[in-house]
Interface confidence: low
């Protein structure tokens, strides 16, 4: 095939073209949390396996201290998912007494922080009721989406419960991201 | 556009450039399962529609058997959704007596197989307890992220009940995988 | 490096290639939704924010009276968040009287319109019974999957009930689309 | 409603700096961009720059870069522009509008007089 | 950087006259998102830009009917079908699809 077929001069290009293979990419998997202090209006942030069985970070797109990295500009597609597992929610005497009330909840937010602003930006979050009645409970919360991102910017995990959260398999609990 | 602007002397690429209409992708839908025997310790396999409706394979990702199969090493998104629907979960009378007790539950597994290796791998995991008093129920449980795959590699969606996913319609339990 | 290792001579192409950042693409947030009426038999529709906040349309993926409009025949994957919000579902009290019933539910479905075909086609739904007892509940569906979509083809969301909607922060409730 | 309330006048000597702020109400500030625009007496207006208040990004004119400096609080939905360096040629009236699909809502401006 | 000129710089006109004043880019000023983002403002003496049009012809709330604007890619109109005292002011095209956003010089619609 000629080169033109490749690079045909009458297309529009706005950014150079580059091999799919070479685009920063993570996923990151689930690992035992040590109990950390975390700030009063802040849910907790998960850190992550990044390089042992599914686990992998490529192409300049490196995970630190919870957080990952972003080394280029661009739209990035970003997912979590957090299984969540605990014993009888509180509230269920409360519902067997009949009277409505603010339920148990868990909840997984994704969060950009950029060094250049104090104020993290919440990019998804999903919460969830739970009012089980008598038995132990689990459940995964899935999120993903896509986010124009800034060389620099940081991404991480937050959870209202650090405790719920299932470490047990890398496939139940995990973090990535990949640039479009 | 002059060609350098398209592939810039200094830009390093680790992967040739290629075309993303050539890339292998694949959605399949769900058709009524067969009951078929299943190993003892693994949860049962469910089929796909590969060519009708909203399915589709293209660019030598093949369906074939319950599998999904890789043509070209390289890091593949991989998702998949399962309906379940269900009558008064047997937990219901226990609960009723107010004991804790270990739930019903359901869950997705989308798992990788390599002619190589024996033991399969267990790319992504959903699953969630099941506590419903004195009604029918049903749920989805979806599941998606970024592996890195080799050529030969199958992927299959396992899940815990096959009698309890809802194969009425094609947009709510389906599985797909693409190149990224 | 030399321009035939970005576009080898024996690579087969199927299309011509094309910067990744020129591809389209949308992320639209939730707003507060406006009653409408909405057609008998069909769930009413979401409008959207396209510009505000992390919403954003990119090349040539324009946002219009609730809908996204596909502007180049291809592969994208379309996903979608809501979530719901309720008080005490109905079914309790037929629950508490140990009768099985219809519980109450709630629906996303992403569907596709084509202006030459009258029916529009469902490509992605999320349905799940809601039966709490004695309590407000909160929880998201989520969606996502690739489909093969043609110029001129427009996307919606509609739900079961939009009064069950939160529209309350732009990272519960959002939906979006890029070209692969 | 929609209200962006500037501060006052300001007078002040060559070379000095000043912090000129625009406080917004009647909407969520940190969804939407603050933009800044200069207008000399006389003179027709000139585009600044703009700051989005959620993660603090910017984006300034070549021409003022160096010049100005965009920042907000959003503890108190405020965002504030710093003048440095300052020359009779920055005397002019400063006025903050947001930025939606359009420059909608505009603060009233602050006059800003350089002189010794 | 685009450069945004407007026609005439003075246009003198009678109460209930129609007024056009005309808005030209250096280039076009379709953002790469499809839209065009092109808008008009009348600034009244000693008061701050008010908006009038967004997007090329779309009316702002509140703004009287007899305002419209319409063009495509570099060349823009804005109409008043029938010229009222309350119009009278110097009126701005500005685009905000390339970075720097960028006015126009102005245009001052005063009586006869």
């Known amino acids: 095939l000629k080169g033109q077929e490749f690079a045909p001069s009458h297309q529009q290009v706005y950014a150079p073209l580059r091999a799919d293979g070479d685009k920063p990419r993570a996923h990151l998997t689930v690992v035992r949390q040590t109990p950390t202090q975390h700030l009063k209006n802040q849910f907790p942030a998960l850190h992550w396996e990044h390089e042992l069985g599914l686990a992998f970070t490529k192409n300049r797109m490196n995970y630190t201290n919870k957080f990952l990295l972003i080394p280029e500009s661009g739209d990035y597609f970003v997912y979590s998912q957090v299984t969540f597992r605990g014993m009888t929610s509180e509230c269920s005497e409360i519902r067997q007494a009949g009277r409505p009330n603010k339920p148990d909840s868990i909840t997984v937010v994704i969060t950009k922080v950029t060094d250049s602003y104090p104020e993290p930006t919440q990019l998804l979050m999903g919460t969830k009721s739970v009012c089980e009645v008598g038995s132990n409970w689990f459940q995964p919360i899935y999120l993903g989406a896509m986010f124009s991102l800034q060389e620099g910017d940081k991404l991480m995990v937050n959870v209202s419960d650090i405790s719920l959260v299932d470490y047990t398999k890398e496939d139940k609990t995990f973090f990535g991201a990949f640039l479009l | 556009l002059k060609g350098q602007e398209f592939a810039p002397s200094h830009q390093q690429v680790y992967a040739p450039l290629r075309a993303d209409g050539d890339k292998p992708r694949a959605h399949l839908t769900v058709v009524r399962q067969t009951p078929t025997q299943h190993l003892k310790n693994q949860f049962p396999a469910l089929h796909w529609e590969h060519e009708l409706g909203l399915a589709f394979t293209k660019n030598r990702m093949n369906y074939t058997n319950k599998f999904l199969l890789i043509p070209e090493s390289g890091d593949y998104f991989v998702y998949s959704q399962v309906t379940f629907r269900g009558m008064t979960s047997e937990c219901s009378e226990i609960r009723q007596a107010g004991r804790p007790n270990k739930p019903d539950s359901i869950t997705v597994v989308i798992t990788k197989v390599t002619d190589s290796y024996p033991e399969p791998t267990q790319l992504l995991m959903g699953t969630k307890s099941v506590c419903e008093v004195g009604s029918n129920w049903f749920q989805p449980i979806y599941l998606g992220a970024m592996f890195s795959l080799q050529e030969g590699d199958k992927l299959m969606v396992n899940v815990s009940d096959i009698s309890l996913v809802d194969y009425t319609k094609e947009d709510k339990t389906f599985f797909g995988a693409f190149l990224l | 490096l030399k321009g035939q290792e970005f576009a080898p001579s024996h690579q087969q192409v199927y299309a011509p290639l094309r910067a990744d950042g020129d591809k389209p693409r949308a992320h639209l947030t939730v707003v507060r939704q406006t009653p409408t009426q909405h057609l008998k038999n069909q769930f009413p529709a979401l409008h959207w924010e396209h510009e505000l906040g992390l919403a954003f349309t990119k090349n040539r993926m324009n946002y219009t009276n609730k809908f996204l409009l596909i502007p180049e025949s291809g592969d994208y994957f379309v996903y979608s968040q809501v979530t719901f919000r309720g008080m005490t579902s109905e079914c309790s009290e037929i629950r508490q009287a140990g009768r099985p019933n219809k519980p109450d539910s709630i629906t996303v479905v992403i569907t596709k319109v084509t202006d030459s075909y009258p029916e529009p086609t469902q490509l992605l739904m999320g349905t799940k019974s809601v039966c709490e007892v004695g309590s407000n509940w909160f929880q998201p569906i989520y969606l996502g999957a690739m489909f093969s979509l043609q110029e001129g083809d427009k996307l919606m969301v509609n739900v079961s009930d939009i009064s069950l909607v939160d529209y309350t922060k732009e990272d519960k409730t959002f939906f979006g689309a890029f070209l692969l | 409603q929609v209200q962006l309330q500037q501060s006052g006048p300001e007078l002040v000597k060559p070379g000095a700096s000043v912090k000129l702020s625009c406080k917004a109400s009647?909407?969520?500030?940190?969804?939407?961009?603050i933009n800044w625009v200069k207008q000399r007496p006389g003179q027709g207006l000139e585009w600044i720059g703009w700051?989005?208040?959620?993660?603090?990004?910017?984006n300034y004119n070549e021409k003022f870069k160096g010049k100005a400096t965009l920042t907000v609080d959003t503890s108190s939905s405020t965002a504030y522009m710093d003048l440095h360096s300052l020359t009779s040629e920055d005397s002019a009236v400063y006025f903050c509008a947001r930025y939606t699909s359009s420059l909608d809502y505009w603060g009233q401006g602050t006059t800003l007089t350089v002189s010794s | 950087d685009v450069v945004m000129t407007q026609t005439p710089l003075s246009l003198p006109v009678s109460l209930g006259d129609q007024a056009s004043i005309s808005c030209r880019s250096s280039?076009?000023?379709?953002?790469?998102?499809?839209?065009?983002?092109l808008e008009w403002y009348l600034q009244k003496p000693g008061q701050s830009p008010k908006l009038l049009i967004y997007k090329v012809s779309n009316r702002f709330s509140g703004v009287p009917d007899r305002f419209s604007g319409s063009g495509s890619g570099t060349d823009f109109t804005l109409k008043i079908s029938r010229v009222e005292a309350e119009d009278l002011g110097v009126y701005y095209c500005f685009q905000g699809s390339h970075v720097p956003y960028t006015f126009g010089g102005g245009t001052k619609l005063e009586i006869k």
């Open positions: 700051i989005y208040p959620r993660d603090g990004r910017t």
């Open positions: 009647g909407y969520t500030f940190t969804s939407i961009d």
């Open positions: 280039q076009s000023i379709v953002h790469s998102n499809g839209n065009t983002y």
